[in-house]
């Protein structure tokens, strides 16, 4: 670059506006330095703090006094009501004390309403512990008399064992079969017979399930209940029972398939009112 | 209150300085890096220096000085509040004495008051005795009230005796009952997994069933025999 | 001091970069001095509302003393009141003492009144006891497990078999009135063509 | 409402002084910082001075050595003395008051340096 000699105007301007500038810098610098921005010290400001937290809370306890003493000062006049008026009586009792008609109405006085609240007060507690100890034996006869029913039933029922419930799955699988070609048959006798003409269709897969269909269908029960038989063979022989044995990846597919073949219906009870008592786990 | 002016959000005071600090033109931007070797003519250098300077000066000197400000006042009247709420305290603290000896002395005129009321319808009820004991007579009413106190000891001893026995019951059934429901129940463990292909095929089943007992009735409905 | 060369654009940004940092640090600065500013802001408002309303407090706590401080008074005086009112009628009674005597009547009331007691405290332990025992009663019931999942796959298995049990009893039914009416058919159609054939012979 | 009106401009020949006078009201003058701004035509506004409430002053590096600027807070009056003026100085220029977020200016008196 070029060269320039110090005496160079221009180069002793630029010199002169570093140094210029460097100076204002530090003239900031002290300006901010002398500013005071102190309010105060932490210690001040935590006093504040809890000086008006203690004097608002001992404001409460003051208040709660004279609060408290308010309510003193009013029983007091109470009483001091209630000397007047005894006072009066006092008065009065001594007069009466001298009068001889007197003694006949004392016959007839009524009780002091003290002795009388106390005696209604008696009487309801009778009634009342008369009443609840018949209610409370009686409740315990129904409940006894419930639990007793209740054990009857449990006798009566027979969990099934696992191999129970799923045989009696797939027996109902059978019997649906049996009844579904069953009632096929009739259909068709029916329609050959002119006197009926079907008019609801099976919602599920077709009209009249086709052999394959049931067939598949079959089998992925079958697959299944070995499937569930297998898991829980497996898990009698591991020593943690609650974890449940994973099934092979072909029973999987097997069983995905037979999910994805059908609408998921809504659950719901499906035998009609006017059918017998459950049959299944009742002992005959 | 004067600290109202800048306190409707906790740190506005602080934002307020930023907003005083904050710069509305950039800093000085040179040239591309591969000229940065080059020494410009002084004239332009000199130039160069002024004009960053001068931005120096009005956008960060000038606002920093109006900051200082700022924060001076406001320091000033933060000192001015906290000096008076000081004495403010102060003076609290001087009333809580005289509530506090108040108090005290509420309590003790209370308190004699009180006696001296205690006193008084002591009196009042030895006075008020002394002219009741002086009539001879139980009324009716205090007659019939005593016969019927007399009768209850008895019915309360049976029942007495009834509520020791229904409590002897209770406990018994209890006892008897917590047995049943302590017994271990036969049951099967199901898995999550083996229980939801039950449900699957339950519900499968119930809709074969249900699409039956459907065809019987429509059977039945439409044919006459 | 003037420099002896001419400055590179380079020298000359790093000198403007310098005081920028130099002011940037100087900034930061002020922030800070404005965020302890702010806390004391802050601590400041929220205390002089808390002495305010301590002011209106004390104030209000000196007035209801006032007021306390006149009932005191106001009572005592008449107490003293009462008390010249009695002092003449215990007097009277002192005088009279010679004359009277404590009579049966005042004793069976006492009695009376004992009983009453004592009966009331009877009363209302036992009613305590049956309200325990009620308590009780009412928090043990609770009601039995119905959400055995294995409960409900029995239920659900008892009423499927009902139900093939129906459709099993109803299909036979309707089986066998099939049949019957299979019979009269084919009973009629032999008899059409017995008819049919006489006919044509 | 606050008013700040300049005063002191004129034609200068170069070289030559002038004493810009500021005054101003509706507002709590030791509580603002002052400033001097010109405008040459054709050109933005540029800070030539100021000086805080405290006194404390900085220049512009044009201004500097020749200019000075100072506050008399009991007339409300802000002044800013130029010497040596040179034909560059020519402007208007503007008196301005800053506190905190608040900047107000005068209408501005015109310094014409000719020779």
């Known amino acids: 670059g070029h060269q320039w000699k110090d005496s160079d105007p221009v180069m002793a301007g630029i010199g002169e506006e570093i140094a210029h500038f460097q100076k204002e810098l530090e003239e900031l610098k002290a300006r901010t330095s002398k500013a005071c921005f102190q309010v105060g010290t932490s210690e001040e400001m935590k006093m504040l703090r809890t000086e008006s937290d203690d004097l608002h809370t001992f404001l409460l306890e003051i208040k709660e006094t004279t609060e408290s003493l308010h309510g003193d000062i009013s029983s007091l006049k109470t009483t001091l009501l209630e000397g007047f008026a005894g006072v009066e009586e006092a008065r009065e009792q001594n007069e009466r004390n001298r009068d001889s008609g007197y003694l006949h109405l004392l016959y007839k006085r009524p009780l002091d309403p003290k002795s009388e609240a106390q005696l209604q007060e008696i009487r309801r507690l009778h009634q009342y512990v008369k009443f609840a100890v018949q209610d409370v034996n009686d409740v315990l006869d129904l409940e006894w008399d419930q639990h007793l029913e209740q054990k009857k039933k449990q006798r009566h029922l027979l969990v099934p064992e696992r191999e129970t419930l799923f045989n009696t799955l797939a027996n109902n699988r059978e019997i649906i079969n049996q009844q579904r070609k069953r009632l096929n048959h009739l259909v068709d006798s029916l329609q050959q017979l002119r006197l009926y003409k079907q008019t609801s269709l099976w919602s599920l897969s077709s009209a009249v399930p086709s052999q394959s269909s049931i067939h598949s269908f079959d089998s992925d029960l079958e697959s299944l209940c070995n499937a569930l038989l297998k898991t829980t063979i497996e898990s009698h022989t591991k020593s943690l029972p609650k974890v449940p044995a994973k099934l092979s990846p072909m029973k999987q597919a097997q069983l995905r398939n037979f999910l994805a073949k059908r609408k998921t219906p809504p659950v719901r009870s499906t035998a009609p009112a006017s059918l017998s008592r459950s049959a299944f786990l009742s002992q005959r | 209150s004067p600290l109202r002016v800048l306190a409707e959000t906790p740190d506005s005071f602080e934002k307020h300085i930023r907003s005083i600090l904050q710069r509305s033109v950039a800093n000085p931007a040179f040239l591309k890096a591969s000229e940065k070797d080059i020494a410009p003519p002084p004239e332009e250098c000199l130039q160069l220096l002024s004009r960053a300077t001068q931005v120096f000066r009005e956008q960060y000197i000038l606002k920093q000085d109006l900051a200082k400000e700022e924060i001076q006042r406001r320091v000033k009247l933060l000192c001015d509040q906290k000096k008076k709420q000081l004495e403010d305290l102060s003076y609290c603290r001087e009333e809580r004495k005289s509530l506090r000896e108040m108090a005290e002395r509420l309590a003790d005129k209370y308190e004699e008051a009180k006696e001296k009321q205690e006193d008084i319808m002591n009196r009042m009820k030895k006075l008020l005795h002394s002219f009741h004991s002086e009539l001879p007579v139980l009324s009716d009413s205090e007659r019939d009230m005593k016969k019927e106190l007399q009768l209850i000891p008895d019915q309360l001893r049976h029942l007495g005796n009834a509520i020791k026995q229904v409590t002897m019951k209770k406990d018994y059934q209890q006892q008897k009952m917590e047995k049943v429901l302590s017994l271990p129940k036969p049951t099967i463990i199901l898995s999550a997994y083996q229980r939801k292909c039950i449900q699957s095929i339950l519900k499968e089943e119930g809709e074969h069933i249900r699409e039956m007992v459907k065809q019987i009735n429509d059977i039945r409905n439409h044919v006459n025999f | 001091a003037a420099a002896s060369s001419a400055m590179t654009y380079a020298q000359l940004e790093s000198l403007i970069n310098k005081w920028s940092l130099e002011l940037e640090d100087q900034e930061r600065h002020f922030l800070q001095q404005a965020t302890q500013v702010n806390a004391w802001d802050r601590t400041l408002i929220e205390n002089g509302e808390k002495i305010t309303s301590l002011h209106r407090e004390v104030e209000k706590v000196k007035l209801d003393q006032k007021r306390l401080d006149q009932e005191l008074d106001f009572i005592l005086s008449q107490q003293k009141e009462l008390e010249d009112l009695l002092s003449p009628l215990e007097e009277l009674v002192k005088e009279q003492s010679g004359t009277i005597y404590l009579q049966h009547a005042d004793e069976e009331r006492e009695k009376t009144y004992k009983l009453a007691e004592n009966i009331d405290a009877q009363l209302k332990r036992m009613a305590q006891d049956l309200k325990d025992i009620i308590e009780h009663l009412n928090t043990s019931g609770a009601p039995a497990d119905t959400s055995d999942p294995l409960q409900q796959i029995c239920k659900i298995l008892n009423a499927h078999m009902d139900s093939l049990q129906w459709i099993d009893q109803n299909s036979a039914l309707l089986q066998r009135k099939v049949e019957e009416v299979t019979k009269v058919c084919e009973g009629r159609r032999k008899e059409q063509e017995r008819s049919f054939r006489i006919t044509f012979d | 409402q606050v008013q700040l009106v300049e005063s002191g401009g004129g034609l200068v020949q170069p070289g030559g002084s002038l004493r810009l006078s500021c005054a101003a009201s509706g507002f709590t003058f030791t509580d603002y910082l002052m400033a001097w701004y010109r405008q040459a035509p054709g050109n933005q506004r540029q800070l030539v001075a100021y000086?805080?409430?405290?006194?404390?002053?900085v220049y512009a590096s044009s201004a500097r050595g020749r200019f000075t600027i100072s506050r008399d807070n009991a007339k409300n009056t802000v002044t800013l003395q130029m010497n040596s003026l040179l034909l560059d100085d020519t402007a208007v220029y503007y008196c301005s008051a800053k506190s905190g977020l608040k900047d107000y200016y005068g209408q501005g008196t015109q310094v014409t340096v000719s020779s």
């Open positions: 000086i805080t409430s405290d006194g404390s002053t």
